[in-house]
């Protein structure tokens, strides 16, 4: 496992829940979708049932203001995003409740959340050069950017 | 066209074993759990369990504990359910049925496997 | 686990009927309710998801409600192609537990 970053050494407290049942596309058009129970993956899909509705939770942070730590959650389930290495996919992982607090280890469930007009980035707390990211029939994992795709669209208010 | 074939009808006698396949073609087999259904004669569905097609990870209901296993060929998109010991009791239709999770959170079965009938007797 | 309980095990209608069946769940699910329909020898088939969606090619007549514990699959004019055995399935948590079934049939 790469090491921590300094920012593990933080403290991060829950704020509240900032975004309900939201699907994540990239720039290739495709939804981030449910793989074999703890993976996520991304596809071109016809329905948009299929795609996986998020919850976003924000934390505080006391560093930089421009970037929100935000958990990640499947709606309606215990289940959270959580970074590992490089290359490797996101897992979701069950927890009871949302953290209150958050530190050490538990920064693989922390993102920072950038917007740039209607792109999203999602940059692991735990490694922060690595980004959520996206390959052509592949799992969602961590990357530096291309040739994965570190950009999303957040879609709300689907039906 | 997403499809999958199951092997061939099997008589079987008491104690013996038998194993049945299941191809899948038409989508990404690692992306789809691949879940297993038993229906007894007369009977209705009763859920398996089902082996996790990336990791090869299987999870079984209770009542498939012990003398059930699942197991993968990847690469020819094959899941096999291998059933030892056999008994008149699991005299049965047993089906594959792909996984699929609609919102990431809801469990349903969207394809199923045309059913290899098991029958035990000595 | 989550036991399913199914109701009616069989029932008999006409042509033309509204046809209810129910499915009560042994805890709170949360919308994750699937039906099924398996015509005599043949495979099961998804029809419903998450209560209420239709599966591509299902036809309209066939709906479903619900929430919490307890769900109803409704046909709304009962279809002579309609003569099968309808499952529910909860969807929330393995073991994926179904109903024990609904055998449906023409008066």
């Known amino acids: 496992s790469a090491p921590f970053s300094f920012l593990s050494n933080m403290t991060y407290h829950f704020i509240r829940i900032i975004k309900h049942e939201f699907i994540l596309n990239d720039t290739l058009n495709q939804t981030i979708i449910r793989a074999n129970d703890q993976y996520l993956t991304a596809a071109a899909i016809h329905n948009l049932d299929e795609a996986v509705k998020f919850d976003m939770g924000a934390y505080t942070s006391s560093k930089d203001d421009t970037k929100v730590p935000v958990i990640l959650r499947i709606s309606k389930t215990q289940l959270y995003v959580s970074a590992q290495d490089e290359d490797q996919p996101v897992l979701l992982k069950e927890m009871p409740e949302i953290p209150k607090t958050i530190t050490g280890s538990e920064t693989n469930f922390l993102f920072f959340w950038e917007t740039h007009g209607t792109k999203n980035y999602f940059i692991s707390v735990a490694h922060p050069n690595l980004f959520i990211a996206t390959k052509h029939d592949n799992w969602v994992c961590l990357a530096k950017g291309l040739p994965s795709i570190t950009d999303f669209q957040i879609l709300e208010n689907q039906a | 066209e997403i499809q999958l074939v199951q092997s061939g009808a099997e008589v079987k006698k008491p104690g013996a074993s038998v194993k049945v396949s299941c191809k899948a073609s038409?989508?990404?087999?690692?992306?789809?759990?691949m879940n297993w259904v038993r229906q007894a004669p007369g009977q209705g569905l009763e859920w398996m369990g089902w082996i996790n097609t990336y990791t090869g990870q299987s999870t079984y209901a209770d009542d498939f504990k012990g003398r059930f296993t699942f197991t993968l060929d990847t690469s020819t998109s094959t899941a096999y359910m291998e059933l030892s010991s056999l008994r008149s009791e699991d005299t049965a239709v047993y089906y594959c049925a792909r996984g699929i999770y609609y919102f990431g959170s809801n469990y349903a079965m969207d394809y199923w496997g045309q059913g290899t009938t098991v029958t035990v007797s000595s | 686990d989550i036991q399913m309980t199914q109701s009616p095990s069989s029932l008999s209608a006409s042509v033309g009927d509204r046809v209810t069946i129910t499915c009560r769940a042994s805890q709170d699910i949360s919308n994750m309710l699937n039906w099924y329909q398996q015509k005599p020898g043949k495979t099961p088939k998804l029809l419903i998801y998450y209560t209420s969606r239709l599966r591509s090619g299902v036809p309209s007549r066939f709906s479903g409600s619900g929430s919490g514990t307890d769900y109803t699959f409704t046909i709304s004019s009962l279809q002579p192609e309609d003569i099968a055995t309808y499952f529910c399935q909860q969807g929330k948590k393995p073991p994926y537990t179904f109903g024990q079934g609904t055998k449906l049939e023409i008066k």
């Open positions: 038409g989508y990404t087999f690692a992306h789809y759990g």
